[in-house]
């Protein structure tokens, strides 16, 4: 029996998730856990409930989804802790040393735990059909369950690198882990592509003092772009880089800024528009930057937020370590850059030390950036 | 009783392999992850990695990947480790262990193999 | 990965004697996954404390340990002849779990 539809998720306050699919008892799960670089995942509230719940939807595990799931989670009552009637988590407490978010934003209780203040006692994710959390059920330590989440904390990450270019990327990265939205990438995490003329090009996402940043790349794309423009970090020509009012679209390529006319690229210190462009209508204002789209600021911090909530501080078990994984791959042509799997299994390194094999997989998209990695 | 039985002293060339086994009993084998631990002579213990039988999902230590394999016969409850590409730095006493409650400390060895290359 | 680091690496205590040897990482280890083993040439390690200051099965009362973070401590009340051996920290808060390089307690 093998792990066959493993998943995992991350949010952009630096915090990702796996879901794994393998009868365990409670124990082994922590174990794996770890073994992973992470531990076994609180689901305490807010944007940390919403990131399981989105790998959950991604799809049923080995099954099918005919029936219901059990998923370890950090959630344990302690030996000469009492069952609390009135609490939303009835005297069970998340094992980490997080502080507490709003523990009445919590899942259910899908049967009231056993009224006792002497043995302890574990708790599991319930999950209808495998991929609707229906709440939480006590459950003995001892017994397995069908699967298990864990979590793992970043301090920083790396945007995601713009293709230009590039096709054929594929990705590598720390613990099953992927986001496919490509939003960001934890450090550890390998993306190579083809550039023009089917040249290899490979860059590690790395941490240092500073932050987190792209090792080996030059420049703010994987591969270069032959003309001026880009359009969601890829090469386009000027005729693609209108929107559907008419605006201005594109962001110019390294080496040229935007034009006085606020719809075209030209060389950089020319200040005139050397290509055609100057009758097409714009709704919108001029860009005082080198390029009309927002760059992105990096290397981001967790920090940073990137917009979002940030889900709790990084928690007692923290991740550094290198398991191994699955090669995941995008076609360039895709406009989202979705991705699809290759069935091998590769290893990567992450910032310190273990590696983790057996993984068949490919994916599909969820929100937020859940990833599939069941058998092919 | 739980009981982890290894397999005997083993002399080899370098650049050969080597394949040791650990056998267990009194213990549901394929609940709980075997780790494997090298000592060097006076030396202190590395912890090598790790193999869960029941899915035979593994862990390395960065370390030894590539130069140990682990796997395991659930059939037989043995757990085996082979070392490939000897070298005088693999001789060592390696030991197999696992965790049975006590918050993965390693609370069962086996007795150790010894390699000497 | 985390380092821990023993001192003193040798240690002579007389019979009777109060010893203590430390145990410091790298970076914050949790107390759960901090544990000690005892060694004796040729043979395996043994458990000896488990969780930071839990004693195994079979380990007498005299061996307690403390700590918490980056610092922990292995302490014998009144040392006995059996006690001569290697003791080994171990972390498994972070993978890869990792050993300290132990310390040899002596007969003086």
């Known amino acids: 029996e093998h792990p066959t539809a493993d998943r995992a998720g991350c949010s952009a306050s630096g915090a990702c998730y796996s879901l794994h699919h393998a009868t365990m008892k409670r124990q082994a799960a922590e174990e794996a856990c770890i073994l992973r670089g992470g531990a076994l995942s609180t689901v305490r509230a807010g944007a940390e409930l919403r990131a399981v719940l989105a790998l959950l939807r991604a799809g049923p595990g080995p099954g099918g989804g005919s029936k219901d799931l059990l998923f370890w989670v950090a959630l344990e009552r302690r030996r000469s802790h009492c069952t609390l009637e009135n609490e939303p988590l009835r005297g069970f407490s998340w094992l980490s040393s997080d502080p507490g978010g709003l523990e009445s934003d919590t899942l259910q209780w899908v049967e009231e735990p056993q009224r006792s203040c002497t043995a302890r006692r574990c708790a599991v994710l319930q999950a209808t059909g495998g991929v609707e959390p229906a709440g939480w059920k006590e459950m003995r330590c001892h017994l397995r369950a069908n699967g298990y989440l864990c979590k793992y904390q970043f301090e920083v990450l790396c945007p995601a690198p713009r293709p230009g270019a590039a096709s054929n990327l594929s990705y590598r990265a720390p613990f099953q882990l992927h986001s496919a939205a490509l939003d960001f990438s934890p450090p550890g995490t390998e993306v190579s592509a083809l550039c023009r003329g089917q040249l290899p090009i490979s860059v590690t996402c790395i941490a240092d003092e500073i932050g987190a940043r792209w090792d080996k790349l030059s420049g703010d794309v994987l591969c270069p772009c032959p003309g001026r423009y880009l359009r969601a970090g890829k090469c386009a020509e000027l005729p693609n880089c209108l929107d559907d009012l008419g605006g201005f679209a594109c962001e110019c390529a390294t080496g040229f800024e935007l034009g006085k006319d606020g719809r075209s690229c030209v060389t950089s210190g020319e200040g005139q528009p050397t290509l055609g462009g100057t009758g097409v209508p714009t709704r919108r204002p001029p860009a005082t930057a080198t390029s009309p789209v927002p760059q992105r600021t990096w290397p981001i911090r967790v920090d940073e937020k990137l917009g979002e909530t940030p889900l709790v501080p990084e928690q007692d078990n923290s991740v550094t370590s290198i398991p191994e994984i699955p090669r995941w791959g995008s076609q360039s042509t895709m406009s989202t850059l979705q991705m699809s799997l290759q069935a091998e299994s590769k290893a990567t390194i992450t910032p310190s030390g273990s590696v983790i094999s057996k993984f068949n997989s490919t994916t599909s998209s969820a929100t937020p950036q859940a990833f599939d990695s069941s058998s092919a | 009783e739980v009981q982890l039985q290894q397999s005997g002293t083993v002399l080899a060339r370098p650049g050969a392999s080597v394949k040791m086994s650990c056998k267990a009993s009194g213990y549901t084998f394929t609940s709980y992850w075997m780790h494997w631990v090298k000592q060097r002579p006076g030396q202190g213990l590395e912890w090598i990695g790790a193999?869960?039988?029941?899915?035979?999902?593994?862990s390395y230590n960065q370390k030894f990947k590539g130069k140990a394999k682990l796997t395991a016969v659930t059939s037989t409850s043995t757990a085996y480790m082979e070392l490939s590409s000897l070298t005088n730095e693999d001789s060592a006493v390696f030991y197999c262990t696992h965790y049975y409650g006590s918050d993965y400390a390693m609370d069962y060895w086996g007795q150790g193999t010894s390699v000497t290359v | 990965q985390i380092v821990l680091t023993q001192s003193p690496a040798i240690m002579s205590a007389s019979l009777g004697e109060r010893v203590t040897m430390t145990c410091t990482a790298s970076s914050s280890v949790s107390s759960s996954y901090l544990h000690w083993y005892q060694q004796k040439p040729g043979s395996s390690p043994k458990l000896w404390i488990y969780?930071?200051?839990n004693l195994a099965s079979g380990v007498p009362a005299r061996f307690s340990g403390s700590g918490s973070g980056t610092s922990y401590s292995l302490t014998i009340s009144s040392m006995e002849a059996e006690d001569a051996a290697t003791y080994y920290c171990?972390?498994?808060?972070?993978?890869?779990?990792?050993f300290g390089g132990g310390t040899k307690l002596e007969i003086k």
């Open positions: 969780s930071t200051s």
């Open positions: 171990h972390q498994y808060h972070r993978s890869p779990r990792t």
């Open positions: 193999i869960y039988p029941g899915n035979s999902d593994t």
